[in-house]
């Protein structure tokens, strides 16, 4: 499938911190009631720690202590039952651990693989259960850097996961993006986690974000968009290419050609030929053989450089460089030089009495 | 507005060959591309191939691939499809289409979508 | 290739009506799947693109939906011009292909 230009996303401005989000399924601890419970924040480096329950922030009251990495619910209750989660914040992102907390009267030894099966129950997204937004598919969305010709359609789409079902938007450099922020504005497919611009044109070009978050997180994934005009030519060749060259009976020569073009260029080389002793026909076109062109084996490389071996007389006289593309053709010529080998007898080419 | 105007078709005998022209105004082929569809009477559309003006490349349908050729001439903003050894198979109505590129920039392609379409000329390949 | 099949190959309908038209691909094409109008001796119309997005002056009461291999149009009120032949058309596989064709006709 044809595709367009993927740059990895290396040398790019700084932007926000990004956040981490856990995509695994959450530990489960169970109390009983009255019972005291404390959880280690499983983040490493961990310089400031926030706290959140049902996607509330948390603070210490009479029953909850946080300290350092550590939380403690004193006398548990049900109502103390939920999703937790603590985030580390550092310099360069933000990392989220979430964990479920349930405070249960019915425990008894054989309850740890109902609480396995509430787990899985969490990632299956039952009602009951609830997660934070997640990627459904993060190898997709690892490079992010597009180059999209002008005139085309683009379309972003950050499909993810979470329940409740998470909610979608879009950012463009940071802002709200909205549908007046562009001519003819885009178009929104929500259960397709889809964004689509029609006929894009350079203005378009820019940070595309998109924001996708529930009452326990919030994720976001960072399009970078370039829109590339282009007026189109036929292809460029170096100047100076191929250049004349001159060699004598039995060496060997190259000619040389560099080709520049957007559009696939078609690269042959020519000799100009003489038939019946004229170099023109009828019509007054040059006579023209064909000596390489680009086949399906050949690389760019190869068919750039024209080797001739074993030179002879022959071979001398006007060589082309031809290159078209579908806008137009262009050529360079030079011309090969044979001279006699030193030290070797010149060839005959008078009548056979005459001798040099 | 865009238009699309196909020209050159006809009668020809099998083995024979035909030059279509798809002439295009309202546009450019800078960025974007043509499409060949052809209808058999009285039966479905198919797609026959596709040039695509970004890097001047083209793609072909199987049972057309070998036989016919798709070029274009940006400067007249025109397109071609050169159809070789043709066939009785080949009698159908030749549509050419402005195509646009879909760039999903999740699942890194493009999908090709025809939205401007020509009236269409009839190609009869009889003995 | 990739199979595209429509169903069914013909309905008839009266003005009002609501019209579904299924496409099934033989292997998952995501979401790049178009929808063309095509009325006799005439030229095809573009109606959907990528499954589900309306092309720019096509009339709101079509609608497109699904992804995979499984695709549904809607007319949610069938209009005296509606009255065609409408083709799918999958275009992530190389080559494109197209539905066989769903004829609608009047009641």
């Known amino acids: 499938r044809p595709s367009f230009s993927l740059v990895e996303d290396t040398t790019l401005e700084p932007e926000e911190p990004p956040t981490k989000y856990q995509i695994s399924q959450p530990e489960v601890y169970v109390a009983a009631p009255g019972e005291s419970l404390e959880v280690r924040c499983l983040l490493k480096d961990a310089a400031v720690i926030s706290w959140t329950k049902d996607g509330v922030h948390l603070g210490p009251n009479n029953r909850t202590v946080l300290i350092g990495e550590y939380l403690q619910i004193k006398g548990a209750t049900p109502r103390d039952s939920g999703l937790y989660a603590c985030t580390a914040s550092r310099t360069v992102d933000s990392e989220t651990w979430y964990f479920m907390v349930n405070v249960t009267d019915a425990i008894s030894s054989g309850d740890d693989e109902d609480d396995t099966d509430g787990a899985e129950d969490f990632v299956s997204e039952n009602s009951n259960n609830k997660r934070a937004p997640y990627w459904t598919n993060t190898e997709k969305m690892e490079k992010r850097l597009h180059a999209v010709p002008a005139a085309n359609t683009v379309k972003f789409r950050c499909p993810a996961g979470g329940n409740p079902m998470p909610t979608m938007r879009w950012l463009k450099n940071g802002k709200e993006f909205k549908q007046e922020h562009r001519i003819g504005g885009y178009k929104v497919r929500n259960q397709h986690w889809s964004l689509i611009m029609e006929s894009v044109v350079p203005s378009d070009k820019g940070n595309y974000t998109c924001v996708v978050e529930n009452e326990y997180g919030s994720i976001n994934h960072t399009y970078h968009l370039d829109v590339v005009e282009r007026s189109p030519h036929r292809p460029i060749l170096q100047a100076g290419l191929p250049a004349n060259a001159s060699t004598v009976v039995g060496g060997d020569v190259e000619f040389v050609c560099k080709v520049y073009s957007d559009a696939q260029p078609h690269i042959q080389w020519i000799k100009h030929v003489e038939k019946n002793g004229s170099k023109y026909g009828p019509d007054g076109l040059p006579y023209l053989k064909v000596l390489k062109a680009a086949g399906v084996n050949t690389t760019d490389k190869e068919i750039e450089v024209l080797y001739i071996r074993n030179v002879t007389f022959e071979d001398a006289g006007e060589y082309t460089c031809l290159a078209g593309n579908s806008i137009g053709i262009s050529f360079h010529s030079a011309w090969l030089t044979v001279l006699p080998a030193p030290g070797r007898e010149k060839e005959i080419t008078a009548s056979p009495d005459y001798l040099e | 507005e865009v238009q699309l105007v196909e020209s050159g078709g006809g009668l020809v005998q099998p083995g024979g060959s035909l030059r279509l022209s798809c002439a295009a105004s309202?546009?450019?082929?800078?960025?974007?591309?043509i499409s060949w569809v052809r209808q058999a009477p009285g039966k479905g559309l198919e797609w026959v191939g596709r040039?695509?003006?970004?890097?001047?490349?083209?793609n072909y349908a199987d049972s057309v691939k070998g036989r016919f050729t798709i070029s274009a001439d940006t400067s007249k903003n025109t397109a071609y499809l050169q159809m070789n050894s043709l066939r009785a198979e080949d009698t159908a109505v030749y549509y050419c289409?402005?195509?646009?590129?879909?760039?999903?920039?999740?699942?890194?392609?493009?999908?090709?979508?025809?939205?401007?379409w020509g009236q269409g000329t009839l190609v009869t390949v009889s003995s | 290739d990739i199979q595209m099949t429509q169903s069914p190959s013909s309905l008839s309908a009266s003005v009002g009506d609501r019209v579904t038209i299924t496409c099934r691909a033989s292997?998952?094409?995501?979401?790049?799947l178009a929808w063309y109008k095509q009325k006799p001796g005439k030229a095809p119309k573009l109606l959907i693109y990528?499954?589900?997005f309306l092309y720019s002056g096509v009339p709101s009461r079509f609608s497109g939906s699904g992804s995979g291999t499984d695709f549904t149009l809607t007319i949610s009120s069938l209009q005296p011009e509606d009255f065609a032949t409408y083709y799918c058309?999958?275009?992530?596989?190389?080559?494109?292909?197209f539905g066989q064709g769903t004829k609608v006709e009047i009641k």
């Open positions: 289409a402005r195509t646009y590129g879909i760039y999903d920039l999740y699942v890194d392609y493009t999908e090709y979508v025809m939205d401007y």
């Open positions: 309202g546009f450019t082929f800078t960025s974007t591309g």
């Open positions: 040039y695509w003006a970004w890097d001047g490349s083209t």
């Open positions: 292997q998952d094409v995501d979401t790049s």
């Open positions: 990528s499954a589900s």
């Open positions: 058309q999958q275009s992530t596989g190389h080559p494109q292909t």
